[in-house]
């Protein structure tokens, strides 16, 4: 029962494909596809693939909701990761090992290398690989604030699980602060949630990168999966482009 | 340099207005405007205006973001409120007054009257009127779980303030649970956030409805502004309509 | 009395003029426009002789595709088999049968339209809507459509029966 | 919802999300994106009827608002509702870069 | 953003949010909604050019994508981006009801 013109589906698809061609270049602020003349032969480095997979996994976990997109968010974000300073570093000696907390420190020079300006950072996530957990545990994340004080950031209720699982905390504001300040090393603390009445405040959850006494090769694998910051930022050259172009809107 | 037809702005406006006519009736599941034959003379009752204003204030505080809207969310939601059981009720005697917590109980029969089926509830907010606060305070909200155990729900960092301010906690899941269970009275606890090291765990914040020793008339005003649950739910008759209509999507 | 017309000159615009009454106002509308129900605005009169598409039903979500005919008046559509009338997927639902709006559009009832060209004793004559001529290929597929007054019949070949929902002749499953 | 679950398994004529896989090499002639090789971009297509609401409303027509013109637009249009980002790997000179492009994958559509 | 701040103070010809106040009595002939008396519904209007991207890309064209076709649609359309709900008070019989209608006020638009 139709007198409608049939839609030329192929034309619509072609127009969509052509629009995507422009969209991707536009999001990357490229006038044309980048030259491939310097690309070395062979597959992508392992570290790059790991980073790509981290990002892809994050996307899969994201709710697919549209958000009003400020202009800066339209453009592509470079993804980098900065691993936690290894636990044998002297910085950890200053913080007494307690049953209720673990500490994670980051080198701000590495952060600055990845994100030169605080304003360029669009998202920072602290990623922790949580190992098996026998009981439910309520944990809290704190930011190192001043000499010996900690500022509460967020909390998470961890369900018991037989398999390891990545935990992700949004720490964008904190990392932006760190990039603005002069400190060399900054850190987080993951603690058991302590209620005012409760006495048992032990951190039961085992986070990869803190367990000691491993065989050499295992320790290396373990170390690769130690806590890290996943950073999404506008590359500096793209940001300068953003500022210099006059915007009507 | 235009060969475009000029847009008939008046026609577009008329079409938008006509579409809104249908949209409002459609959202209210009305086939035509409701009869006004039974409407009493005079202004709207105070309680209704207060409820309308609460809802309007909530809207103003909401971020104007589009959310993928499930079919049930398209239709209008009836707004009601259920006040906390007054503090002289015996239920409060069972919970020792502590420096770090206050308790809020609700009559589930009142909740059920407002929302007969758990599935009809689309949002429940616990609203507390926070009075002046001299220092920053980190508070936590708990739900009464079993005899003497409490389940953590959420937390809030309250900034110092000279003026009273409404606090709002999303407790949709909890109220949905309560509607499903048989209990007569259910409750929340607002506590100071207790860190594992800290000793000073006093709840500094003053919540309207808990301060004693007021003059009679003040106590009444005070009581009207005591904690309440703001409920948004699909009216039962509209829900039956929703279930009965066949949906291809 | 407040003169609403001088207080708000935009009342009744753009398709009419404002006329003040005691305690109220009404709109005097331009040609081709008619006052709204409350007489506080002017809306376009859908000329009965405008020809647009006739839509079969609103049950199917693809009703933009369920076009009975493409060049029919609102009366021809709504006073016969149509559920909606319009074009480019912009649809005026036909008034519900037996409502005041239906009687206003179809004063002679289902199956008839008024013919303003033929006037008997000052009253427009009604004529039967020939559904077969207007909708034949869509309402009597695989059969022979015969116009009746009012309505139509669809005759099917032996071994077939007419399915009133599908509007076509369907093989009898023996 | 007019999402991939509903639309890919139905023959919906009206507004719906439609399948479209883009292979960077085949469709765009690009070899410079090293990962992924392509992605399910999808797109929205199909009419969103505008229903002139008469004073005599009735349920059958009103029920259609939810799908066909929930935003009461003067000219409703089939557009993306839920979108997802796409991470890509490409080289700038000798340096491989991982970048995330926002709002690249259409998961569902709506009349708006 | 194509929001009320920008659009109401400019003469933007392209996609933008346009002012529209709806007075329930005057515009709809309705006296049954007791609160509010009307509301700023607004609406989206204006073209969203489709830019055929040629193999010879150049910055001038690419810069337009962000505004005119950020979603890389085959037929971009000016639609609401940020919406707000509207609470209303009306009577059912003798009983006053407060109800909230979702997505009624258009705050900003986008090409989608």
């Amino acid at each position: 029962l139709s007198t409608c013109k049939t839609i030329d589906m192929e034309l619509v698809k072609r127009k969509r494909i052509e629009a995507i061609r422009g969209q991707i270049l536009s999001k990357l602020r490229l006038a044309s596809p980048p030259s491939q003349g310097e690309v070395p032969p062979g597959p992508l480095p392992e570290a790059v693939l790991a980073l790509y997979n981290s990002t892809r996994d994050r996307v899969a976990g994201e709710s697919a909701e549209p958000e009003p997109e400020p202009e800066a968010d339209y453009y592509a974000k470079e993804v980098t990761r900065v691993l936690m300073v290894e636990t044998h570093n002297e910085i950890y000696d200053k913080f007494k090992q307690s049953t209720h907390s673990i500490y994670m420190f980051f080198n701000t020079s590495e952060l600055r290398e990845a994100v030169p300006e605080p304003v360029l950072l669009s998202r920072a996530e602290l990623r922790l690989l949580r190992l098996k957990l026998k009981v439910e545990q309520h944990v809290e994340l704190y930011q190192k604030y001043s000499n010996n004080s900690w500022r509460y950031l967020s909390n998470r209720l961890l369900a018991p699980s037989d398999s390891p699982e990545w935990l992700s905390f949004d720490v964008t504001g904190v990392v932006r602060q760190w990039l603005s300040r002069g400190g060399e090393i900054e850190g987080f603390r993951l603690s058991a949630h302590c209620s005012c009445d409760s006495r048992d405040n032990t951190l039961q959850v085992d986070i990869n990168g803190f367990t000691t006494g491993r065989r050499g090769d295992l320790a290396t694998i373990h170390g690769m999966n130690r806590p890290f910051l996943l950073l999404m930022a506008t590359p500096l050259e793209r940001a300068q482009h953003l500022q210099s172009s006059r915007h009507r809107r | 340099l235009s060969t475009c037809k000029t847009i008939d702005m008046e026609l577009v406006k008329r079409k938008r207005i006509e579409a809104i006519r249908g949209q409002i009736l459609s959202k209210l599941r009305l086939a035509s405007p409701p009869s006004q034959g039974e409407v009493p003379p005079g202004p709207l009752p105070e309680a209704v205006l207060a409820l309308y204003n609460s809802t309007r204030d909530r809207v103003a505080g909401e971020s104007a973001e589009p959310e993928p809207e499930p079919e049930a969310d398209y239709y209008a939601k009836e707004v009601t409120r259920v006040l906390m059981v007054e503090t002289h009720n015996e239920i409060y005697d069972k919970f020792k007054q502590s420096t770090h917590s206050i308790y809020m109980f609700f009559n589930t029969s009142e909740l059920r009257e407002a929302v007969p089926e758990p599935v009809l509830l689309s949002r429940a907010e616990l609203r507390l009127l926070r009075l002046k606060l001299k220092v920053e305070q980190h508070v936590e909200l708990y739900q009464k779980y079993s005899n003497n155990s409490w389940r953590y729900l959420s937390n809030r960092l309250l900034a110092p303030s000279d003026s009273p301010e409404w606090l709002s906690f999303d407790v949709t899941g909890v109220v949905r649970q309560w509607l499903s269970r048989g209990g007569e009275i259910e409750g929340f606890r607002l506590s100071a956030h207790c860190s594992c090291d800290s000793r000073d765990n006093t709840l500094q914040v003053d919540i309207n409805g808990f301060t004693t020793g007021r003059r009679g008339d003040l106590a009444t005003i005070h009581g009207m502004n005591r904690p309440f649950l703001l409920l948004m739910a699909t009216p039962l008759e509209r829900a039956q309509h929703l279930q009965s209509s066949r949906h291809r999507r | 009395d407040i003169d609403e017309c001088s207080q708000d000159p935009s009342l009744c615009l753009p398709h009419g003029a404002c006329k003040n009454l005691q305690g109220s106002y009404v709109c005097v509308c331009d040609e081709g426009f008619t006052p709204t129900q409350d007489q506080h605005g002017c809306e376009e009169v859908e000329q009965p002789h405008h020809k647009k598409e006739c839509y079969l039903n609103f049950d199917d979500t693809v009703f933009c595709d369920s076009v009975l005919a493409t060049n029919v008046t609102q009366q021809e559509c709504c006073c016969s088999l149509g559920a909606g009338w319009g074009d480019h997927c912009e649809i005026y639902p036909c008034p519900v049968y037996s409502s005041a709006e239906f009687h206003s559009l179809c004063p002679d009832g289902k199956g008839y339209t008024q013919d303003n060209n033929i006037v008997n004793y000052g009253i427009p004559a009604h004529r039967d809507i020939d559904e077969c001529m207007l909708f034949g290929s869509e309402i009597c597929k695989e059969g022979k459509c015969v116009n009746t007054q009012p309505g139509y019949e669809c005759y099917c070949k032996q071994g077939f029966y007419y399915d009133g929902n599908l509007l076509e002749c369907v093989d009898v499953d023996e | 919802a007019l999402d991939t679950n509903y639309c890919f398994s139905s023959t919906e004529k009206n507004c719906c999300v439609r399948q479209l896989y883009i292979d960077f090499r085949k469709d765009l002639g690009w070899k410079w994106i090293h990962e992924p090789k392509g992605y399910h971009a999808n797109f929205c297509l199909g009419p969103c009827p505008y229903i002139w609401s008469l004073d005599t409303q009735y349920s059958k027509v009103l029920a259609l608002y939810n799908q066909h013109n929930p935003g009461a637009s003067a000219a409703p249009c089939c557009v993306p509702q839920a979108l997802e980002p796409l991470p890509i790997v490409y080289y700038v000179g000798r340096k491989p870069k991982v970048e995330q492009l926002s709002n690249m994958i259409v998961r569902s559509c709506k009349c708006s | 953003a194509l929001d009320t701040n920008y659009c109401f103070s400019s003469t933007e010809k392209n996609c933008c949010v346009r002012q529209l106040y709806i007075d329930f009595r005057k515009d709809l002939g309705w006296k049954w909604i007791h609160e509010p008396k009307g509301y700023h519904a607004n609406f989206c209007l204006g073209p969203c050019p489709y830019i055929w991207s040629l193999d010879t890309q150049y910055s001038k064209v690419l810069a337009l994508y962000n505004q005119h076709n950020p979603g890389a649609s085959a037929a971009p359309c000016c639609v609401p981006q940020a919406l707000e709900p509207l609470p209303i008070v009306y009577y059912v019989g003798r009983k006053p009801k407060v109800e909230q209608l979702s997505n009624m006020i258009v705050r900003s638009c986008k090409c989608s």
């Epitope: 030259s35 491939q36 003349g37 310097e38 690309v39 070395p40 032969p41 062979g42 597959p43 | - | - | 090499r25 070899k31 410079w32 090293h34 080289y91 000179g93 000798r94 | -």
Partner: antibody, heavy 119, light 107 residues
Framework: QVQLVESGGGVVQPGRSLRLSCAAS????????MVWVRQAPGKGLEWVSA????????YYADSVKGRFTISRDNSKNTLYLQMNSLRAEDTAVYYC????????????WGQGTLVTVSS | DIQLTQSPSSLSASVGDRVTITCRAS??????LNWYQQKPGKAPKLLIY???NLQSGVPSRFSGSGSGTDFTLTISSLQPEDFATYYC?????????FGGGTKVEIK
Amino acid sequence: QVQLVESGGGVVQPGRSLRLSCAASGFTFSDYAMVWVRQAPGKGLEWVSAISGSGFTTYYADSVKGRFTISRDNSKNTLYLQMNSLRAEDTAVYYCARVSSGHWDFDYWGQGTLVTVSS
Amino acid sequence: DIQLTQSPSSLSASVGDRVTITCRASQSISSYLNWYQQKPGKAPKLLIYAASNLQSGVPSRFSGSGSGTDFTLTISSLQPEDFATYYCQQTYTVPLTFGGGTKVEIK
């Protein structure tokens, strides 16, 4: 259209040197890595050497490492292969080819130039 | 170095035949494999890149498949102009290596 033209081949005695050139046209030369591939008479293809678009990075087959040098002059759109200490087993048709992408497929080839190393 | 072994080294076929040539790598090379066609006295011509992608301008009767260590070049219906020698090439790691070639002759 893309064109690659090799030159500089010929007969040379073992231990001597030869310089091959490849003139490129029809594309932005500096945007592409380039390679030399050779084919001994009646035999299969053997990759010899490669160079990145800027000339910054070079790669060699073990059989020629230390004897052959690949270079390019982007201002002249020309690729070179300097062959020193030539051996009889270096006798082959030498092709220059363009590296199409980061995948290192060779999408355009020259017609080849014959190098004969013989005493 | 990564060795590529092509089989068969030669084959005879008729016009219209379906022809399959295989290439096996001495270790996994993911999809970093290309196929070339070479006619006597001519330069090689790229047919397939990245194991399965048809180079622009190459007839669709040519197709490539495989990943890891085992790869296949298929000519769905052999044409007179397809009689030539076919080489596989890995670009997974330097040194880049070619297979020994497969000569397709007229039966």
